[in-house]
């Protein structure tokens, strides 16, 4: 079958890097600047992703290949392939349409990006909170209370929040 | 009692792309972060990403960021890990795991999918 | 991301040994700090979490203790069943990170 269609179609030989130029009795022609191929066979050039304003070029763009954008800093990515960026809050906070918000009193966020969490249900598990949480820091869970030997003290104060904490992803 | 059950081993050629699977049970699959392990013949482990079912939210380390997609399914109290576009530094023991009550600690660990990339 | 050095990364004891592994942050981790035992096996076990917390079931000869960037992970009296590879990992910061490892021999 291979082989059939390089005969039909002489664009089927045409390398990633390239394009069938109908315009030169199809003769593979390297993309022009700017422009890629990721596969063989293809009658055009996609044009090359620009990384301008708050997104920055992780990768360049090759012939084969598109650029691939981040965020700078201040800022993370989201979406499939870093299609937008988005700004960074504090540990402790989350963006909201007003800009970053402290956690409320039982929710956390150990990370400058998302949302803030309600502290962990120990208790589902049938543990006990062995480290408080904070608005930066979930509570450690420790073992059941029965499992604690008498006299022992079930909770530890929280442990103090630092910079840079969880680094945005 | 609190179990995490994976996919079995795969053998792959290069390029090619796998998706392991980890099943949960024991337990409520949404309250728990599930990540994933990376351990390569005869060395450490590496840690991968991480998914909160509940939300699908996903913590990835950036060395795998091109490499791992990590998903989750509440219906079935199932965590995937795809590898795309494999190579030979592929080939390892995965492993998924269960944090024991926030997420700084992997409490449960699953038996480990072994993946080879071979020609 | 943080770096964890550990040691040593194989050791050799009799049964009834104590034995003592270290583990250093590159930076402080406060007491976010995991041990974990790999069987021969490849099957693995959270021992002691947030620097010397015992899981629930684990034997009163294993003991963690540390904080910041020095951490020590002790066997008090070694056992035949002990034979494995123990790892330290930090959880206060993403991503995680994992020491080398320690394999564990007895003599």
């Known amino acids: 079958f291979e082989r059939t269609r390089s005969l039909q179609d002489p664009c089927s030989n045409c390398p990633a890097g390239t394009f069938c130029d109908n315009n030169r009795n199809q003769i593979c022609s390297p993309c022009p600047p700017n422009s890629f191929s990721s596969a063989g066979g293809q009658r055009t050039c996609d044009i090359c992703r620009q990384c301008k304003g708050v997104f920055r070029t992780r990768k360049e763009c090759s012939s084969t290949s598109n650029a691939e954008c981040d965020c700078t800093p201040g800022f993370h990515c989201l979406g499939a392939g870093c299609s937008m960026c988005e700004q960074d809050c504090k540990q402790g906070q989350e963006l909201t349409k007003k800009g970053c918000k402290d956690c409320c009193f039982g929710t956390f966020n150990d990370q400058k990006r998302g949302i803030c969490r309600p502290w962990t249900n120990c208790s589902l598990d049938g543990k006990s909170v062995l480290v408080n949480g904070t608005k930066e820091r979930d509570v450690v869970c420790g073992p059941s209370p029965a499992d604690l030997s008498p006299g022992a003290s079930s909770v530890t104060p929280p442990a103090p929040a630092r910079e840079p904490g969880h680094s945005p992803q | 009692q609190v179990q995490l059950v994976q996919s079995g081993a795969e053998v792959k050629k290069p390029g090619a792309s796998v998706k392991v699977s980890c099943k949960a049970s024991?337990?409520?699959?949404?309250?728990?972060?599930i990540n994933w392990v990376k351990q390569a013949p005869g060395q450490g482990l590496e840690w991968i990403g991480n998914?909160?079912?509940?939300?699908?939210?996903?913590n990835y380390n950036q060395k795998f960021k091109d490499k791992a997609t990590i998903t989750a399914d509440k219906s079935t109290s199932t965590a995937y890990m795809e590898l795309s576009s494999l190579r030979s530094e592929d080939t390892a023991v995965y492993y998924c795991?269960?944090?024991?009550?926030?997420?700084?600690?992997?409490?449960?660990w699953g038996q480990g999918t072994t993946v080879t990339v071979s020609s | 991301d943080i770096q964890m050095t550990q040691s040593p990364s194989s050791l050799s004891a009799s049964v009834g040994d104590r034995v003592t592994i270290t583990c250093r942050p590159s930076?402080?981790?406060?007491?976010?700090l995991n041990w974990y035992q790999q069987k021969p096996d490849k099957t693995v076990k959270l021992l002691a979490y947030?620097?010397?917390r015992l899981r629930s079931g684990v034997p009163s000869r294993f003991s963690g203790s540390g904080s910041g960037t020095d951490f020590t992970f002790t066997i008090s009296s070694l056992q035949p069943e002990d034979i494995a590879t123990y790892f330290c990992?930090?959880?206060?910061?993403?991503?995680?990170?994992f020491g080398q490892g320690t394999k564990l021999e007895i003599k």
């Open positions: 795991t269960r944090d024991y009550g926030s997420a700084y600690s992997m409490s449960t």
């Open positions: 024991g337990y409520t699959f949404t309250s728990y972060w």
């Open positions: 998914i909160y079912p509940s939300d699908s939210y996903t």
């Open positions: 930076q402080d981790i406060s007491n976010y």
């Open positions: 947030y620097t010397g």
């Open positions: 990992q930090q959880g206060d910061t993403l991503p995680y990170t």
